[in-house]
Interface confidence: low
């Protein structure tokens, strides 16, 4: 292997100086081949300062970090090189604002599977302005990042995410944004027309229910959007128009719990002719009981009635 | 460093059973989506089944579907292909292989060693 | 399902030599195309995704280019261990087919 274990005893470098070119901090396993220092799994309670400056991929999953403070990777001189960031499974239970400040060339960063009770709205955008300077970010990956009930702040989960990703408009520059596995029951009006670069956006194995106040009409560059395993009952006529027009989609609606009543017909009569659907043959009603496992392609407007019973409220979300 | 090791392959007779495994590590295997793809002695590679990071969705080639099964443990890191009813025309190196994360994410972008699988009277 | 043709199915080369193999697709995927290097006995290696995007690690005289249903991947200087079959790969749907493959063998 090309990567280098640092001796314990290098911890004490004085983390005032920049670091020399072959150290490598504590605990971690470095290659200035690869450009790559990984502190992965050792407990560590806080980023190590002597971080070597030619580090372009930076692991430190699997540690024990639960603050991330403002500047917690700023250095000088800077880290100009770091472009992607790993920072899953840290146990991090709060990022404050200005936490990522001071990496330019900062392209990917992953806070995946962190118990996030405290996400600061001005995380990424580094601060309080109305316009920040953009944030050199093209990749976020925040799956999992939802906290236990008992941590949760008061204000919604949702909210406090969307906060944090239109904050400055810092983020507009950014390609690939994965929010998913974090219980969202909404997807708040405003994020997307804030994200207007966006290539790839997977919101799946969420709690979602409906697209109704959702826009994703600026959004002219999406090519993925995932949006699996959440809990969808019918996609709206708006909905469908404004995805039928983004050029280069692919939309992929596996395991949500279709109603297939009487308001899934424009759905039915769409899903029949687009080509935006991946895997629309595998797409199936999961309500009524009478049309459970019923695959939507298959069905026709005879097939599709409301039960004149149930009040209107009911019939549909 | 990633690495994915297959196991279970072997010799079997038509119509009978394995079961491969694929034990991955050196990265977060619950957050990627995987595939089984099988490569024929001589010939090119055939994708053969996907399953999505969560389990929750899989696909399957349509040479093999009703007679293999992918699943998943995150628990345990591994990858699973229950293969039934095999046929002479299965007979193959069998690779599991991480689906890719960046901006296009549908590449596979590591590879396992691979295990032969031959089925053969 | 998309089908990927690749040309030639085999050629000659000798080291230095700058090779191109090329891949077309039964309908547009845009740029999604990924090409691997597979040698003797081992497992398929990454070389280059999303048709132009050089893999980490992969040295530069790789490149990719093309869009909509023609590419071409280029070695621009052959190495001795360049020599090995190359397939390309369409990403545009979440199942995987791929090319036929193309063998590159010392002249």
């Known amino acids: 292997s090309s990567f280098s274990s640092s001796a314990p005893f290098l911890a004490s470098a004085a983390s005032a100086q920049p670091p020399l070119p072959d150290q490598c901090p504590a605990l971690c396993e470095c290659s200035e081949a690869a450009r790559t220092v990984k502190c992965v799994n050792r407990n560590l309670t806080e980023v190590p300062t002597d971080l070597p400056l030619y580090v372009r991929n930076l692991f430190l999953t699997g540690n024990q970090l639960a603050v991330l403070p403002a500047g917690a990777f700023a250095r000088r001189p800077p880290l100009a090189e770091l472009a992607a960031l790993n920072l899953s499974g840290s146990r991090l239970d709060e990022v404050r604002a200005g936490a990522f400040e001071h990496l330019p060339s900062l392209r990917q960063l992953d806070l995946s599977h962190n118990p996030l009770a405290y996400l600061s709205p001005f995380a990424f955008s580094g601060s309080n302005a109305s316009i920040s300077a953009p944030s050199p970010l093209v990749e976020l990956i925040l799956n999992h990042i939802v906290p236990p009930d008992d941590k949760r702040q008061n204000r919604s989960f949702e909210g406090m995410v969307a906060a944090a990703l239109v904050a400055g408009r810092a983020l507009q520059g950014l390609h690939l944004l994965e929010l998913a596995s974090n219980h969202f029951l909404y997807l708040p009006r405003d994020v997307l027309a804030q994200l207007p670069s966006l290539r790839y956006l997977d919101l799946s194995n969420n709690s979602l229910v409906s697209l109704t106040y959702v826009s994703f009409r600026n959004l002219t560059h999406l090519e993925s959007l995932h949006l699996e395993d959440n809990a969808l009952k019918v996609l709206h006529n708006g909905t469908l128009a404004e995805l039928q027009g983004l050029p280069h989609v692919r939309v992929f609606l596996d395991n949500n719990p279709w109603v297939c009543d009487c308001h899934m017909a424009d759905m039915v009569t769409w899903l029949k002719q687009t080509e935006v659907v991946q895997g629309k043959d595998r797409l199936t009603c999961a309500f009524p009981e009478k049309m459970r496992n019923r695959v939507l392609l298959e069905l026709n407007s005879a097939d599709l009635d409301c039960d004149p019973i149930l009040p209107p409220s009911l019939q549909t979300s | 460093e990633v690495q994915l090791l297959e196991s279970g392959g072997g010799l079997v007779q038509p119509g009978g059973s394995l079961r491969l495994s694929c034990a991955a590590s050196?990265?977060?295997?619950?957050?990627?989506?995987m595939s089984w793809v099988r490569q024929a002695p001589g010939k090119g590679l055939e994708w053969v089944s996907s399953?999505?990071?969560?389990?929750?969705?899989?696909y399957y080639a349509d040479s093999v579907k009703g007679r293999f099964t992918i699943s998943r443990d995150n628990s345990k890191n591994t990858l699973y292909l229950q293969m039934n009813s095999l046929r002479a025309e299965d007979t193959a190196v069998y690779y599991c292989?991480?689906?890719?994360?960046?901006?296009?994410?549908?590449?596979?972008?590591?590879w396992g060693q691979g295990t032969l699988v031959t089925v053969s009277s | 399902d998309i089908q990927m043709t690749q040309s030639p199915s085999s050629l000659s080369a000798s080291v230095g030599d700058r090779v191109t193999i090329t891949c077309r697709a039964s309908?547009?995927?845009?740029?999604?195309l990924n090409w691997y290097q597979q040698k003797p006995g081992k497992a398929p290696k990454l070389l280059i995704y999303?048709?132009?995007s050089l893999q980490s690690g992969v040295p530069s005289r790789f490149s990719g280019s093309g869009s909509g249903t023609d590419f071409t991947l280029t070695i621009s200087s052959l190495q001795p261990e360049d020599f090995a079959t190359y397939y390309c790969?369409?990403?545009?749907?979440?199942?995987?087919?791929f090319g036929q493959g193309t063998k590159l063998e010392i002249k």
């Open positions: 292989a991480r689906y890719g994360r960046n901006v296009h994410p549908y590449n596979l972008d590591y």
């Open positions: 309908q547009s995927i845009s740029s999604y």
């Open positions: 999303a048709a132009s």
């Open positions: 790969q369409q990403g545009y749907y979440y199942l995987p087919t």
């Open positions: 050196g990265f977060t295997f619950s957050g990627s989506s």
């Open positions: 399953i999505y990071y969560s389990g929750s969705g899989t």
